[in-house]
Interface confidence: medium
């Protein structure tokens, strides 16, 4: 058993049929010595008396809010949550496996630049009685500070018969050094509580590996005289790190016909303009990637040829 | 050229060669993103390779103030990686494919380090400890980790030279 926060405790249980469970001793936080009784949740049934209560925690029915009273007055509470371990593996029932970039990916994180700011998100099908708490650091043995906000519900989607809820959190490294080469990964830890079930999820990454620039901005076409060619121009996204002479991007320009089956023409360039042939009903798209480190490409920015 | 006296390197040449190094480092190990840090075993290897740190003066402001600190740091790292790529970790079994970019990568590391410090100029003696003998079963993982670290190192070096070529060239 360990303390998650004040008056909230997590009991770690090996979860199998007829498991013996865990013996827990609760102590009433009071100077009083006699006349103390204990109840669980809203029930008025007295579970025991005395300053301490010893219980055997085996299942969710044994978890919940234990309250000690004296003469109708509440003295203190202890909320017991369960963390299940099945076949030596902690349960992951609350969050959905996003399976990208690999199986058992529950948390996904992205950064728009090298400022030390990043966003993580996760999915669940649970709609109520759900709380999240997020902590992060750079390195684990001698951790350096990363400050995370509160996790918020950022999207709801319908998937077949189910509703899916996306939660996200923004974090910022306290003393970020955008130009340095990271040697210690960022660690992100999410505590998830659904009713009386506790689970924790972790992710470890370098900012450089989760970089995904915003799409190029101000995408414009300029037809070239007496030619089917156009000059496409764009700018670095506002959110990208500066100066651009140091934090450089490379770009992919694509000409795509109306039909998905039509051949795509692609040009790669380090410049912020390119000359391409504009076919009728086609569209021109541009995306960006860090020039020197192959992290994710941005989403496409697009304009129609006409 | 970056020499102890503090003259400038051939920024544009360094830019071109460092960008080539980035391309080679990724073609030598393109699938880097798909391996989980926590599945890689010993973290010591990552700590054993050079890193360009915050105080090394490789940020735009530090380069403007005095690029020598950063260039020396990059030079040290290039020599270090060049030695690693020439060690039995890469030359021993299992053999690399004949067309592996590791050979080109090794030569380019040497080329860029020489551009930074031509013959006859010395920042300091390059000191590198004895490498642990590695076995075939350890080498694949070591190659992966070294190449992945090298990708990060040369990305910073390439940014430095690109910025230098754009803003510090005479």
């Amino acid at each position: 058993i360990w303390e998650l926060k004040k008056d909230v405790y997590v009991v770690e249980l090996d979860w199998y049929p007829d498991a013996p469970g865990e013996m827990v001793v609760l102590t009433c936080d009071t100077p009083e010595e006699d006349g103390i009784t204990w109840t669980l949740d809203q029930s008025s049934e007295v579970l025991g008396s005395g300053k301490t209560l010893t219980i055997q925690v085996k299942e969710f029915g044994d978890a919940g809010q234990y309250t000690c009273h004296k003469g109708g007055e509440v003295l203190s509470h202890s909320l017991l949550l369960l963390h299940k371990k099945e076949d030596g593996i902690w349960s992951t029932d609350i969050l959905k496996d996003q399976k990208e970039p690999k199986n058992k990916t529950f948390l996904r994180c992205e950064a728009k630049n090298y400022s030390g700011r990043f966003t993580c998100w996760w999915l669940t099908t649970i709609s109520t009685d759900l709380t999240f708490s997020v902590k992060s650091s750079r390195g684990s043995s001698d951790p350096q500070g990363v400050t995370c906000g509160a996790a918020t519900l950022s999207a709801e989607r319908v998937r077949g018969d189910n509703k899916e809820y996306e939660y996200s959190v923004e974090c910022q490294e306290d003393s970020a050094c955008p130009a340095a080469e990271e040697s210690l990964p960022i660690e992100v830890m999410v505590d998830a509580v659904h009713k009386l079930k506790y689970e924790n999820y972790t992710s470890s990454f370098f900012i450089r590996d989760i970089i995904k620039p915003d799409p190029p901005k101000n995408l414009q076409l300029k037809p070239l005289k007496n030619s089917r060619q156009v000059e496409v121009s764009w700018e670095y996204p506002d959110t990208w790190s500066t100066p651009h002479s140091y934090f450089s991007l490379t770009f992919c320009v694509q000409v795509q016909g109306k039909s998905k089956r039509e051949k795509k023409d692609r040009v790669f360039t380090d410049k912020t303009s390119a000359t391409v042939i504009c076919r009728k009903n086609a569209s021109i798209s541009v995306r960006a990637q860090d020039r020197y480190y192959s992290s994710s490409w941005s989403e496409w920015a697009s304009v129609p040829c006409s | 050229r970056a020499v102890p006296g503090g003259s400038s390197p051939a920024w544009t040449q360094c830019q071109q060669l460092s960008q080539k190094l980035c391309t080679l480092a990724w073609s030598a190990h393109p699938l880097v993103g798909h391996m989980d840090l926590r599945e890689e075993g010993d973290e010591e290897t990552t700590n054993d390779v050079p890193h360009i740190q915050c105080g090394d003066g490789c940020d735009p402001q530090g380069l403007r103030d005095n690029s020598q600190f950063c260039l020396q740091r990059i030079h040290q790292g290039l020599i270090f990686y060049e030695k690693l790529l020439g060690s039995d970790i890469f030359t021993g079994e299992p053999s690399l494919l004949p067309d592996s970019p590791v050979g080109q990568l090794h030569a380019s590391l040497l080329g860029l380090s020489q551009l930074l410090q031509p013959e006859g100029h010395h920042w300091e003696t390059q000191q590198i400890p004895s490498l642990s003998p590695s076995q075939p079963w350890q080498r694949l993982l070591l190659r992966f980790k070294i190449l992945r670290s090298l990708q990060a190192f040369v990305a910073v070096a390439a940014r430095v030279f690109a910025h230098g070529a754009a803003t510090l060239s005479p």
């Epitope: - | 010993d42 010591e44 290897t45 700590n47 054993d48 390779v49 050079p50 890193h51 040290q76 790292g77 020599i79 270090f80 990686y81 690693l84 300091e124 003696t125 390059q126 000191q127 590198i128 400890p129 004895s130 490498l131 642990s132 003998p133 590695s134 076995q135 079963w137 350890q138 070591l142 070294i146």
Partner: antibody, heavy 120, light 113 residues
């Protein structure tokens, strides 16, 4: 928790071969480099040699002609043999491990040591 | 071989006072690439094996009290005990693992004054 324990005869005659065993528990020996170090009574520490994770060895040049270090992975055991001993080889013999890295490490776990006296 | 010279050979310090031991290798132990110094400090009490205190010149081994600290780089290293405790009476050794053969300093005997 990694544990190392040296064992072997406490007395060896001059010109004979000293043989010691180091048994490792609490981890697979394949991920350790195991070193032998000795300490003559009342004196300092001297590195004898190492057997690397892959089974290759390196020895102190001052002892190289007389030392053999080997291992038996099935028994999680390492052995030290020092031939043609003299009274100068009387010492406490330790085995110690370092964790495999790109470069050889420091010794983080040591055995308790075994005293070997060379005397007729 | 790299020769490790420790000073002083013996040292008597009052309880609660600072103790300082030096170690000078005959060549630099600083790896210019990764900026690590391949030097460790050990404490040995009578009848016991050496115990690792500090590695990479300045990193304290887990479980070692924070009164022990290591500093220095290249060819000059120091082990400092900020406030001597009775249980710190021992012989202290430095070790280089930059090149083999690994070599130890000759040891410094620390006693209470």
């Amino acid at each position: 928790q990694v544990q190392l324990q040296e064992s072997g005869p406490g007395l060896v005659k001059p010109s004979e071969t000293l043989s010691l065993t180091c048994t490792v528990s609490g981890g697979s020996i394949i991920s350790y480099n195991v070193h032998w170090i000795r300490q003559p009574p009342g004196k300092g520490l001297e590195w004898i040699g190492v057997i690397w994770t892959g089974g290759s060895t390196d020895y102190n040049p001052s002892l190289k002609s007389r030392v053999t270090i080997s291992r038996d992975t099935s028994k999680n055991q390492f052995s030290l043999k020092l031939s043609s001993v003299t009274a100068a080889d009387t010492a406490v013999y330790y085995c110690a491990r370092d964790k495999y890295g790109l470069f050889p490490g420091y010794f983080d776990y040591w055995g308790q040591g075994t005293l070997v006296t060379v005397s007729s | 071989d790299i020769v490790m010279t420790q000073s002083p050979d013996s040292l008597a310090v009052s309880l609660g006072e600072r103790a300082t031991i030096n170690c000078k290798p005959s060549q630099s132990l600083l790896s210019s690439g990764n900026r690590k110094n391949y030097l460790a400090w050990y404490q040995q009490k009578p009848g016991q094996p050496p115990k690792l205190l500090i590695y990479y010149a300045s990193t304290r081994q887990s479980g070692v009290p924070d009164r022990f600290s290591g500093s220095g780089s290249g060819t000059d290293f120091t082990l400092t005990i900020s406030s001597l405790q009775a249980e710190d009476v021992a012989v202290y050794y430095c070790l280089q693992h930059f090149n083999y053969p690994w070599t130890f300093g000759q040891g410094t005997k620390l006693e209470i004054k």
